[in-house]
């Protein structure tokens, strides 16, 4: 060392501004100052390494008025790699001055490159668009040479400009863009090996996402209790954020703040800081503000803070103190207005018990009573009881809830009869409507007429949009009516109201309406009456079973109000199957005020039209088919016989006799009678009886007397019988003349 | 929420072309670097093909070089691999994947499309 | 045939611990770092390692990942039914200039 001028700066004994050696040798660097001085070392150099030595400044020089140190490094490492400084120690003379030197030694390792290895993990790099970002690959020699890589396959070139490469520092981006967000890494290849150590750049956000404060606003406290609000601030994962309270106690810091970040969410930072204050008073009142900053981004969340001397309660009705609502509704809210602090404990009373315990449908919500699916049962008294026990404080209010129900007519809700019921023409029928509402709902009777024409079938001559008529006792309209009466009844532990209206003389179809209603609604139901002159709205009758050559006649007669669609059909059976099979040549229909008839001749019948013949007809409102059956079973001819001979008779004269000609056969025969061959005619005092099988005489006189024959005739044949009448006794013909 | 969704596969006969999309959302699609990687029924994950962050430089698996061509519009956050010449071995469920943290791994995945090549 | 090799199947009762092995190169484990994937049946895979031994959020720490030279391991402690499932682990491969996968390893959780 030269002992010239006084040194300004502390003088190094290796010159220039980097200094390279290899790994294994001992560094040597003296420092020569003016003032006592100390050293500062590269990170990685630990002050407790052995192999460090550092002599204490001691005099030297210029009459031994200088200070002089002496660093030694044993076998230096290339993680020994960096700036060795040489620093004067702060005193009121030097502060002034740059007041150190320094000098960057590199410790030159083939083995080792860079002189941090990042090669199991990354090392994570806070980037910011915008701003310089460095990927510190420091390596431990100048001359290695070193590529920048971003997985998987881009390779970052030193252009001087906006990436350049300090063998000091690493790469150097001047603005960092998105493309360096990633893995990166740094490469050098020496001695034919390649090493690689790498970064991953994280980039650094402002992004604010939410800043909320708990518990929320306002917060109510008594004097003396202690305050604590968190405010919570949600950033992305990159995001660093500073917070801050204004308060009303700021000034004397009333409060303590405590921070912390919560980083087990995937995708969000979450930030918090806690404001305390112990022991609140009235001047701790007012607004409290969380402040959260992040680089240029900024949100406040507001909360006020209310301190009351002591608790206080006081309630009013929100509502009416008569509420009303409707049985069925989802749910009904009784609510009460209430002003108190601290929170008092609430119970509501139903009818004088806790109403909670009466059914799980009532739960208590704030000051509010929630019944869930509103029932009669729900009407009644209800109590908010409120206390506040440390304060002894107790208030209480009741409302009353009334709980009306839309009219229900009970018979609409029994399941009613597929098809409507027939009501016998003359009959007196008495119909009737249970009715249920609360208020009690008003009940009338009205008539639907419906068109009345028999000209022609109609289906749809009954409708319910026709114009409609209210009844009373007296209305002529439709049917007489005897009377419109209602009385109340107790029904399932409920007062129903039973209106009936009795019809003296069912004679006009149509339809009765019994509509009840109240101010919640009106529901009506309606009757169709359906008048009917065939017994059970359907009959099928056979004249005669006939007889081989005969006729057949048969007649179905169906409700028209109930039936259409009416045909005769001959059901067969074959193979265990039931077929229909449909006959011709049927009639027309014809349509009477309240029935169809369809008539069936077939004429001239043989044996194979014995069968089962079915009336089929479709109900109008179930759509089904009905049949009513009849079995047809076609006699076979037969000749005509005799029961009886007629045998030789004698009568007194003036007297009455009856000779009897009684003939079996199929078809039944034809009887003929005949006197000495001549037919004999009905004529006074000559009578023949039923089918002609029975000849009477009145007064019988000599000319009476003669062959008497009977012939029993049919298409099979013909017999006959002969019997000789002798009439006894004179004649008193000519006395009478 | 982060996702990718892939689109585009059917039945196709040997010799045929598909184009392949896989459309992302909840991330920043633009800084990451894409993968397309299929599996065959009952087989292991193949991977097919890789493109950068900005689409400027691919790489694709030898079996597919030269018939399927990797690449992305950022404008529309979706990666696309167009398959031609395509032969029954290449029939598989094919998935899209990508980073979006930190791990640079494929961290994402879509559900897959199905590709079937059959006469 | 996979670049990378691991076992076709592995097994364990509930409780136990397992461990997946899978073995490459110097072009592909050696250089670079090694990720599993747990792929449930009719699923996606799933990420379940990075950078050898890193567990992304969500991941269990039964799972832990190893790497030493060409070769890489998944271990799975305390293995429970839910863990039946094929592990896949993958790298980047330098002459490939791409990634690469192990064939599989299905893991049957028995009892």
């Known amino acids: 060392y030269g002992s010239g001028s006084k040194l300004k700066v502390p003088e190094l004994s290796l010159k220039g501004t980097q200094h390279v050696m290899q790994a294994g040798q001992t560094l040597f660097l003296k420092c020569r100052g003016e003032a006592a001085h100390s050293w500062s070392l590269p990170t990685t150099v630990s002050q407790e390494d052995k192999r460090l030595s550092i002599t204490p400044p001691s005099a030297c020089g210029r009459d031994n008025r200088q200070f002089c140190s002496t660093l030694t490094l044993d076998t230096a490492q290339a993680n020994h790699t960096g700036l060795y400084t040489c620093r004067y120690l702060p005193t009121s003379t030097s502060k002034k001055k740059k007041a150190e030197s320094s000098i960057y030694i590199f410790v030159s390792d083939a083995g080792s490159p860079f002189i941090e290895m990042h090669t199991d993990i990354p090392k994570l790099v806070h980037m910011t668009e915008g701003r310089q970002l460095i990927i510190p690959c420091r390596v431990t020699s100048p001359n290695v040479t070193v590529t920048l890589k971003k997985f998987p396959f881009d390779t970052l070139t030193p252009d001087g400009q906006r990436i350049t490469w300090d063998s000091r520092r690493g790469f150097i981006i001047a603005n960092a863009t998105y493309k360096e967000i990633g893995l990166l890494n740094c490469e050098a290849t020496v001695n034919g090996h390649l090493y690689q150590t790498n970064y991953l750049t994280h980039r650094q956000t402002n992004t604010i996402l939410d800043v909320q404060i708990r518990p929320p606003s306002p917060v109510r406290l008594l004097h003396g209790q202690t305050l604590v609000l968190n405010c919570t601030a949600t950033t992305e994962l990159n995001t660093r954020v500073q917070m801050s309270w204004n308060y009303p106690g700021k000034a004397t810091k009333r409060a303590s703040i405590r921070q912390r970040i919560d980083r087990s969410h995937s995708h969000n930072n979450v930030f918090h800081s806690v404001l305390k204050i112990n022991n609140v008073e009235s001047r701790d009142k007012g607004l409290y503000t969380c402040r959260v900053k992040s680089g240029s981004s900024f949100q406040s969340f507001n909360t006020s803070v209310h301190v009351y001397e002591k608790g206080f309660i006081s309630v009013k009705h929100r509502k009416q103190p008569v509420q009303e609502t409707t049985a069925g509704r989802r749910s009904y809210r009784l609510s009460m207005k209430v002003k108190a602090f601290p929170s008092p404990e609430i119970v509501w009373l139903k009818d004088g018990s806790p109403a909670t315990l009466k059914s799980a449908r009532y739960l208590v919500h704030g000051y509010s009573l929630i019944i869930k699916d509103v029932t009669t049962e729900d009407a009644g008294d209800y109590t908010i009881l409120l206390g506040i026990k440390q304060s002894r404080l107790f208030k209480n209010l009741t409302a009353t809830l009334i709980v009306n129900v839309k009219p229900q007519i009970y018979e609409k809700s029994v399941s009613s009869l597929p098809s409507p019921p027939l009501y016998p023409l003359g009959s007196r029928q008495v119909l009737t409507c249970t009715v249920y509402g609360i208020p009690r709902p008003t009940i009338t009777w009205l008539w639907h007429p419906c068109h009345h024409n028999h000209s022609k079938e109609r289906y749809d001559f009954c409708t319910e949009n026709e114009e409609s008529f209210i009844l009373d006792p007296s209305s002529n309209l439709g049917n007489r009516i005897e009377s419109i009466s209602q009385r109340m009844t107790v029904i399932e532990g409920t007062n129903k109201t039973v209106s009936t209206l009795v019809v003296a003389d069912s004679q006009t179809p149509g339809i009765y309406s019994c509509r009840a209603f109240n101010k919640i609604g009106t529901v009506e139901r309606n009757i169709k009456f359906y008048v009917t002159d065939v017994p059970n709205g359907f009959h099928v009758s056979l004249e005669k079973m006939p007889a081989e050559g005969e006729d057949l006649k048969l007649s179905c007669v169906v409700n028209k109000f109930l039936y259409r669609d009416i045909t005769w059909i001959l059901l067969r059976t074959v193979n265990n199957r039931t077929m229909h099979h449909s006959i011709s040549k049927q009639k027309m229909a014809t349509t009477q005020d309240y029935s169809i008839t369809l008539n069936l001749v077939i004429k001239n019948v043989s044996l194979e039209d014995s069968g089962t013949y079915a009336c089929r007809a479709r109900n109008i409102y179930t759509g089904e088919d009905i049949l009513r059956k009849t079995e047809v079973l076609v006699r076979d001819s037969e000749a005509p016989h005799l029961l009886q001979n007629l045998s030789d008779y004698e009568v007194s004269i003036s007297g009455s006799t009856t000779l009897d000609c009684q003939a079996r056969g199929v078809p039944a025969p034809q009887i003929t009678w005949f006197k000495n061959n001549h037919k004999i005619q009905q004529e006074p005092g000559i009578i023949l009886g039923p089918g002609n099988s029975t000849l009477f005489i009145e007064r019988v006189t000599e000319e009476d007397e003669g062959v008497y024959r009977c012939r029993a005739t049919n298409q099979k044949g013909a017999v006959e019988s002969a019997a000789y009448l002798t009439v006894q006794g004179t004649s008193d013909k000519s006395n009478l003349e | 929420e982060v996702q990718l969704l892939e689109s585009g596969g059917g039945l196709v006969q040997p010799g045929g072309s598909l184009r392949l999309s896989c459309e992302a959302s909840?991330?920043?699609?633009?800084?990451?670097?894409m993968n397309w990687v299929r599996q065959a029924p009952g087989k292991g994950l193949e991977w097919v093909a890789t493109i950068n962050s900005e689409g400027t430089i691919t790489s694709h698996a030898p079996a597919v070089k030269g018939r399927f061509t990797i690449s992305r519009d950022n404008s529309k956050n979706t990666a696309y691999v167009q398959m031609n010449s395509l032969r029954a071995e290449d029939s598989a469920v094919y998935y899209c994947?990508?980073?979006?943290?930190?791990?640079?791994?494929?961290?994402?995945w879509g559900r897959g499309t199905t590709v079937t090549v059959s006469s | 045939q996979s670049v990378l090799t691991q076992p076709p199947s592995a097994s364990g009762t509930p409780g136990q611990r397992v461990t997946i092995s899978c073995s490459g190169s110097s072009s592909n484990i050696q250089n670079n770092y090694v990720y599993w994937y747990q792929q449930l049946p009719g699923t996606a895979p799933k990420l379940l390692i990075y950078f050898n031994s890193q567990r992304p959020s969500g991941v269990p720490d039964r799972f832990s990942g190893s790497k030493s030279g060409t070769s890489a391991s998944l271990a799975i402690s305390g293995l429970q039914s839910e863990d039946e499932a094929d592990y896949y682990c993958g790298t980047w491969d330098d002459s490939l200039n791409g990634w690469v996968f192990g064939g599989g390893t299905k893991l049957t959780v028995l009892g």
């Open positions: 994947s990508s980073t979006t943290g930190t791990t640079h791994g494929m961290d994402v």
């Open positions: 909840g991330f920043d699609f633009s800084t990451y670097a």
